[in-house]
Amino acid sequence: FERTRSLQDPCSNCPAGTFCDNNRNQICSPCPPNSFSSAGGQRTCDICRQCKGVFRTRKECSSTSNAECDCTPGFHCLGAGCSMCEQDCKQGQELTKKGCKDCCFGTFNDQKRGICRPWTNCSLDGKSVLVNGTKERDVVCGPSPADLSPGASSVTPPAPAREPGHSPQ
């Protein structure tokens, strides 16, 4: 089948990094600067992703593969393939529409992203507070006074990413 296709379509012989140039009798021409083709048999090369603004280049574009971007320092990626960047905050803060704000009393955030979450309520598990919570850290629950068995620290899942799109002021 492959041989038959080659006889019928000369473009199928054009390798990645080239395109089948209809203006030049369907010969394989190299992709122009700032473009690429990652598969063979392409009739055009795609323009490379440009990493600028809040994005920076993680991998340069080549004739056979697209550029890859990540975020500049002070920002983190959101979405598939780092489709957007969001401003970092300090631990103990969360990102709001007005910028980074400290976690309210009774909540914490131990990451540079995500939202402030309530401290664990130790009493719900019949335990007592062993170490008080802070803006940056959850409380540590210990055994209740009546409980002689050793207490276990509470484990909290990582904070989910907040809805993207707050600009740095």
């Epitope: 603004g53 489709s83 957007m84 993207p164």
Partner: antibody
Framework: EVQLVESGGALVQPGGSLRLSCAAS????????MDWVRQAPGKGLEWVAD????????YYVDSVKGRFTISRDNAGNSLYLQMNSLRAEDTAVYYC????????????WGQGTLVTVSS | EIVLTQSPSSLSASVGDRVTITCQAS??????LNWYQQKPGKAPKLLIY???SLQSGVPSRFSGSGSGTDFTLTISSLQPEDFATYYC????????FGGGTKVDIK
């Protein structure tokens, strides 16, 4: 409140020069890339140029490369567009705009300044 | 150059109508697509960024969808202040705008 105010538009002869300014206020200017976008009378929007936070990185649309220079003065919270060898097709309202620093969208725009190139 | 083709170039609608504007990119631009509204004599205003995220302060009747090459801006119930020209813009590579869609009163 974020504000961008352009100035410097004028009537200029073909081949002449002009310098546009954009005064920024209400935000930390040094935290943002800035752009120039233009709109010819009765036509659509055309991106012209942008510049990074410290002024070391600049990009231009092909039609103005070698003729226009984008620059910024971070101490004075100002953006500039130096336009040389002006042509009739450069006639447009020129807007300065702020890159939102999240995905390449322009979240604040000035009111625009009109550049007319005619003899 | 990545070309953005908007359709229709103009449309007439009535208050309360559902309006849909499309923008087609000449190649895959993932979700690097933004929408702006412009009224005569005024600067453009950002409505939607990253294909579907609503800009702060923009009414929820505006929504965006799509990824890759095909994108849509929808106004669920047209209001008198929505009569304007709408532009799509790609920020995947060297920025570029679509030709615009003028929405006027039927």
């Amino acid at each position: 409140e974020v504000q961008l105010v352009e100035s410097g538009g004028a009537l200029v002869q073909p081949g002449g020069s002009l310098r546009l300014s954009c005064a920024a206020s209400g935000f930390t200017f040094t935290n943002f890339w800035m752009d120039w976008v233009r709109q010819a009378p009765g036509k659509g929007l055309e991106w012209v140029a942008d510049i990074n936070k410290d002024g070391g990185e600049k990009y231009y649309v092909d039609s103005v490369k070698g003729r226009f220079t984008i620059s910024r003065d971070n101490a004075g919270n100002s953006l500039y567009l130096q336009m040389n060898s002006l042509r009739a097709e450069d006639t447009a309202v020129y807007y300065c705009a702020r890159d939102a620093m999240r995905g390449g969208d322009l979240d604040y725009w000035g009111q625009g300044t009109l550049v007319t190139v005619s003899s | 150059e990545i070309v953005l083709t908007q359709s229709p170039s103009s449309l007439s609608a009535s208050v309360g109508d559902r309006v849909t504007i499309t923008c087609q990119a000449s190649q895959d631009i993932r979700n690097y697509l933004n929408w702006y509204q412009q009224k005569p004599g005024k600067a453009p205003k950002l409505l939607i960024y990253a294909a579907s995220s609503l800009q702060s302060g923009v009414p929820s009747r505006f929504s965006g969808s799509g990824s890759g090459t095909d994108f849509t801006l929808t106004i669920s119930s047209l209001q008198p202040e929505d009569f304007a020209t709408y532009y799509c813009q790609q920020s995947y590579s060297t920025p570029g705008f679509g030709g615009g869609t003028k929405v006027d009163i039927k």
